[in-house]
Amino acid sequence: MAPWPELGDAQPNPSKYLEGATSQQPITPDKSKETNKTDNTEVPVTKFELLPTYSTATLIEEPTEVDDPWNLPTLQDSGIKWSERDAKGKILCVFQGIGRLILLLGFLYFFVCSLDVLSSAFQLVGGKMAGQFFSNSSIMSNPLLGLVIGVLVTVFVQSSSTSTSIVVSMVASSLLTVRAAIPIIMGANIGTSITNTIVALMQVGDRSEFRRAFAGATVHDFFNWLSVLVLLPVEVATHYLEVVTQLIVESFHFKNGEDAPDLLKVITKPFTKLIVQLDKKVISQIAMNDETAKNKSLVKIWCKTFTNMTQMNVTVPSMANCTSPSLCWTDGIQIWTMKNVTYKENIAKCQHIFVNFHLPDLAVGIILLIISLLVLCGCLIMIVKILGSVLKGQVATVIKKTINTDFPFPFAWLTGYLAILVGAGMTFIVQSSSVFTSALTPLIGIGVITIERAYPLTLGSNIGTTTTAILAALASPGNTLRSSLQIALCHFFFNISGILLWYPIPFTRLPIRMAKGLGNISAKYRWFAIFYLIIFFFLIPLTVFGLSLAGWPVLVGVGVPVVFIIILVLCLRLLQSRCPRVLPKKLQNWNFLPLCMHSLKPWDAVISKFTGPFQMPCCCCCRVCCRVCCLLCGCPKCCRCSKCCQDLEEGQEAQGVPVKAPETFDNITISREAQGEVRAPDSKTECTAL
């Protein structure tokens, strides 16, 4: 579509729309954002029951009915067609394209690096505490405790591979059985899905974008939670994962392989190791009850060390501690023996920022946490902006069709499975499901990928991360090979089982429906997203952890009534939506409960009261930053700034606070034309699709 008005499709019957239409759909702010974005130009919607306005000059084909918010937005081409450009314009366009690609790759690189640093920051802040979770002896007997420990540790260290490697070393040291390790692995699977949910929060500025991004991210969460909900009881009852993996491990005579290939790390490590380097062994040592490790710092100081094995005379408490009777003696007071002692000589210090600061782990962690979140947020905003400007017109159409279109009949069902393979392959390449799903999130947000397509990609990502773990297990030393391989296979089969549960039959794709539901709620009440994050990844696991420590009777005593209420509510909800007539009139809706128990509106009012004072200053800051950004990017003056403020303005308008006087021309395209501003195609104008 051309960027300026064109005649055509004139309304055939003007009398139809001028006066008499009474069954008017209310205009929603969502719709205005989602459909047909031109130059990011958006104008606050004045909330009156207006009739749809038609013109003989059809500018934008806006449907009169409210669109499905889950439909992908039309990424409008606001640039000049390639054929209409002169040679200079074409060259400039090519250079702009290359520049954008370089910028995109650069921001993507720093995005991945910031995820790595974020993981390090979380480990510094909560790593030691996470390690102590593992040293709890009740894990052996309580699978539920194992599950929540898996969730909490992975959330605290922001790395499922760290928590899995701790489990592997504990199994190898016989501190943990494979049976007890399986729930922890399930928990780690849940915990790792928090990363892309955090990334989705960064897109909170635009409601419709946020709706899609948050749903796209939480589809991973729901898949993991639902899989655990079904498979943990099955595993506790049958031990099928333990049995199957044991058979596989015992049927092969594995030799130690080479290290699993570090593919993406090869590029990111040189940068991230200049920021901080961690001694990951410390968390494992704490988990294995090593008292000396509790006082060690996680920040690595010495990167080059020389380890020398030497025989040393050491004192022992009694003759029983002697390596052999002939290698034992006394000095008259103490008993001595000869032991092989590894003496570590420090040769060269690491080359990261914090090496000479000698700050406590918590301080370094908090500093890195703030910096990495800012970089993550900044990179994400820039990635979304660049993608938004690139993915317009024909480019967008091609990409969206390629990614979201199914194979022709009768092979349409295969498309999802190919997506699973693509997700697994991509995750194997980047060596991290967090990185892959986090990179996917903004693409879902801006509408390049549908949630229906993101779902199998995410499932594939879950498989990909387990294949990496299997490779890493095959490369592990002899003493840990069996246990690490069995645990990696448990992880693999757990994800396979989850896919079989929640993917093959379209009806069973509950995670999509649940994620969309949560996306809708979060788009309306954006605070609910953070609320969800805190409840599902912190409060519930910590509560279960606390109750488990109190013992089975307490856990059952509290858990059973809670589970009963949840089941009751779900059944009632199902009956209300499917066959309400079965229910008594009072139970056909939730109105019999206080409003705060069945609606988020009162909660929203309370939260708005607390956050209100921060909204306007934040908005002003946002607007200033945006204007600066617009100046740097050379955006048109009409560029609508700070989408995050739009809802605030709408809210104020609804309350009768005038935000800006209504203008004659709210549509920028019309206003420019009317004021004689429509210019001939200029080579300097924004370059987008070919």
Epitope: N313, P325, S326, C328, W329, T330, D331, G332, I333, I335
Partner: antibody
């Protein structure tokens, strides 16, 4: 050089006690054990016990437990052995000897104190 | 207690001769054995520790060997000043115990 000085002789009555000293010089007193050894013509060399002056830890031969008490004074770098309830069998030469660090060989010996129990 | 047995109470040798003094432990003591020389009217002097290690300042004609329960102390070229009592001592476990001693005399 390392030196251990002991008084030449002590004459004591049966049933009485004697406290003999071993003054050291030429090394750090608190780093090595101090052993006490009894020598009689009939019994040869017998180990009485040892003290670690660094923390006052002691070890005794079961045969001399209750009979000998080992102490050390860090300020004067002197080790002491008190023998109580003496009988004629206690008549012997008593040596203090410095233990080598980390094992029970004795590298430097005092000249010995000759104890004579006689009424 | 570990008993250290020196089978010869006396040994008679001429100057320049080679002498081997044996010592047997009642149980395995590894190599935790020391040898001392005591001249008449003097205090003992350490010659060998760890069964084979010569103490500083000890002439190399004095050597030690053995491990476990059987130990040998050798003077390869007997000198007149070597006339003395020789004791073995174990420090494998408390109480530390000494052998009865072997007296080296000149022929």
């Amino acid at each position: 050089q390392v030196q251990l000085q002991q008084p030449g002789a002590e004459l004591v009555k049966p049933g009485a006690s004697v406290k003999m000293s071993c003054k050291t010089s030429g090394y750090t007193f608190t780093t090595n054990n101090m052993h006490w050894v009894k020598q009689t013509p009939g019994q040869g060399l017998e180990w009485i016990g040892a003290i670690y002056p660094g923390n006052g830890a002691t070890a005794y031969n079961q045969k001399f437990k209750g009979k000998a008490t080992l102490t050390a004074d860090k300020s004067s770098s002197t080790a002491y052995m008190q023998l109580s309830s003496l009988t004629s069998e206690a008549s012997a030469v008593y040596y203090c000897a410095r233990g080598m660090y980390g094992h029970g060989a004795m590298d430097y010996w005092g000249q010995g104190t000759s104890v004579i129990v006689s009424s | 207690d570990i008993v250290m047995t020196q089978s010869h109470k006396f040994m008679s040798r001429s100057v320049g001769d080679r002498v081997r003094i044996t010592c047997k432990a009642s149980q395995d003591v590894g190599t935790a054995v020391a040898w001392y020389q005591q001249k008449p009217g003097q205090s003992p002097k350490l010659l060998i520790y760890w069964a084979t290690t010569r103490h500083s300042g000890v002439p190399d004609r004095f050597t030690g060997s053995g491990s476990g329960t059987d130990f040998i102390f050798t003077i390869s070229n007997v000198q007149s000043e070597d006339l003395a009592d020789y004791f073995c001592q174990q420090y494998s476990s408390n109480p530390l115990t000494f052998g009865a001693g072997t007296k080296l005399e000149l022929k």
